[in-house]
């Protein structure tokens, strides 16, 4: 999916209002310095591309993120403010259904969510730079 035509301001508002709080809740008990950020993004479409992939693509070390509240809200936000996004996400929905139901938060998942927070913060910063 090409995120170029999304309403970035609306996505930013949704992130600040709800998604960020859910991410921080998920990370509760860990310090921001506990994990190294190893990925970043360059502009708004790039940030959303990587956020989408990291949130919804299961990895061997952390297969369960797509079921989390922040992931559900991320999906809803992208569907709302990115034209045609929801039509491209049938496969992602299947991946979510296959995701583990276990609510155990592993260290690797915490690390992945730490990376997500970094990508979202970069998204906000690139938005501020463009204004």
């Amino acid at each position: 999916y090409d995120f170029t035509n999304c309403d970035f301001q609306k996505i930013e508002a949704d992130y600040l209002r709800t998604i960020s709080k859910d991410l921080i809740t998920y990370m509760s008990g860990t310090k921001s310095t506990d994990f190294n950020n190893t990925v970043s993004c360059s502009n708004r479409p790039h940030c959303l591309t990587e956020i989408q992939s990291l949130t919804f693509n299961p990895t061997p070390r952390c297969a369960s993120l797509a079921k989390e509240m922040f992931a559900r809200k991320t999906k809803a936000t992208l569907a709302l403010w990115c034209p045609g996004y929801s039509e491209t996400q049938i496969n992602a929905t299947q991946a979510m259904k296959k995701a583990r139901k276990s609510k155990v938060t592993t260290n690797k998942c915490l690390e992945q969510v730490s990376q997500l927070l970094g990508l979202w913060r970069r998204f906000i910063r690139t938005l501020l730079k463009k204004q």
């Epitope: 190294n36 950020n37 190893t38 990925v39 970043s40 993004c41 360059s42 502009n43 479409p45 790039h46 591309t49 990587e50 992939s53 990291l54 693509n57 990895t59 061997p60 070390r61 992945q112 990376q115 730079k129």
Partner: antibody, heavy 117, light 108 residues
Framework: QVQLQESGPGLVKPSETLSLTCAVS?????????WSWIRQPPGKGLEWIGY???????SYNPSLKSRVTISRDTSKNQFSLKLSSVTAADTAVYYC??????????WGQGTLVTVSS | EIVMTQSPATLSLSPGERATLSCRAS??????LAWYQQKPGQAPRLLIY???SRATGIPARFSGSGSGTDFTLTISSLEPEDFAVYYC??????????FGQGTKVEIK
């Protein structure tokens, strides 16, 4: 410390597919970062080809996108480049590199690939 | 596509002298600029990222400055091992990251 090593055929015929592999040691490619390919034609500058992230997303240079595939094998801790329909213009030293999806902080030594019949 | 233009193509200097290399972008890249050093037969090495941050292990004699479209890499006092080709790279315009054509710093 992470080390990267490119391997693959040094000679490819025009119209065929160039295939290279980058073996990574000292760091798990599924733990973090992105893993990238960059090339440098003889005596010329650098050109970014694309990357695959540790979580599997890929991004390619638009000028090469229709011909490029980057994939990974986490069990072998390596990632690969396939470039189809090559011409003499694809003759270059091909580097693999670690990236934070923006810039490139560790590089392999490079491998020269010549496209010729 | 953002075109990166480096000048001069070649810089002839003596050890101990100050080197000033220029990189100009065809449109603003904010502070999203990196510098690399490449010696003959070797891979490039990251020197500077985000315009002015030194990469791990890079000596303090290397510094970067600029913003928008005009950037500078300065080597305060050239050491014998600094004679090489230097490339700038913009990463503002994903997915079209681009490099300059290089500046060769040679011994005078």
């Amino acid at each position: 410390q992470v080390q990267l090593q490119e391997s693959g055929p040094g000679l490819v015929k025009p119209s065929e597919t160039l295939s290279l592999t980058c073996a990574v040691s000292g760091y798990s490619i599924s733990s973090g970062y992105g893993w990238s390919w960059i090339r440098q034609p003889p005596g010329k500058g650098l050109e970014w080809i694309g990357y695959i992230s540790y979580y599997g997303s890929t991004s390619y240079n638009p000028s090469l996108k229709s011909r490029v595939t980057i994939s990974r094998d986490t069990s072998k801790n390596q990632f690969s480049l396939k470039l189809s329909s090559v011409t003499a213009a694809d003759t270059a030293v091909y580097y693999c590199a670690r990236t934070n999806l923006l810039y490139f902080d560790s590089w392999g030594q490079g491998t020269l690939v010549t496209v010729s019949s | 596509e953002i075109v990166m233009t480096q000048s001069p193509a070649t810089l002839s200097l003596s050890p101990g002298e100050r080197a000033t290399l220029s990189c100009r972008a065809s449109q603003s890249v904010s502070s999203y600029l990196a510098w690399y050093q490449q010696k003959p037969g070797q891979a490039p090495r990251l020197l500077i990222y985000d315009t002015s941050s030194r990469a791990t292990g890079i000596p303090a004699r290397f510094s970067g400055s600029g913003s928008g479209t005009d950037f500078t890499l300065t080597i305060s006092s050239l050491e014998p091992e600094d004679f090489a080709v230097y490339y700038c790279q913009q990463y503002s315009n994903w997915p079209q990251y681009s490099f300059g054509q290089g500046t060769k710093v040679e011994i005078k």
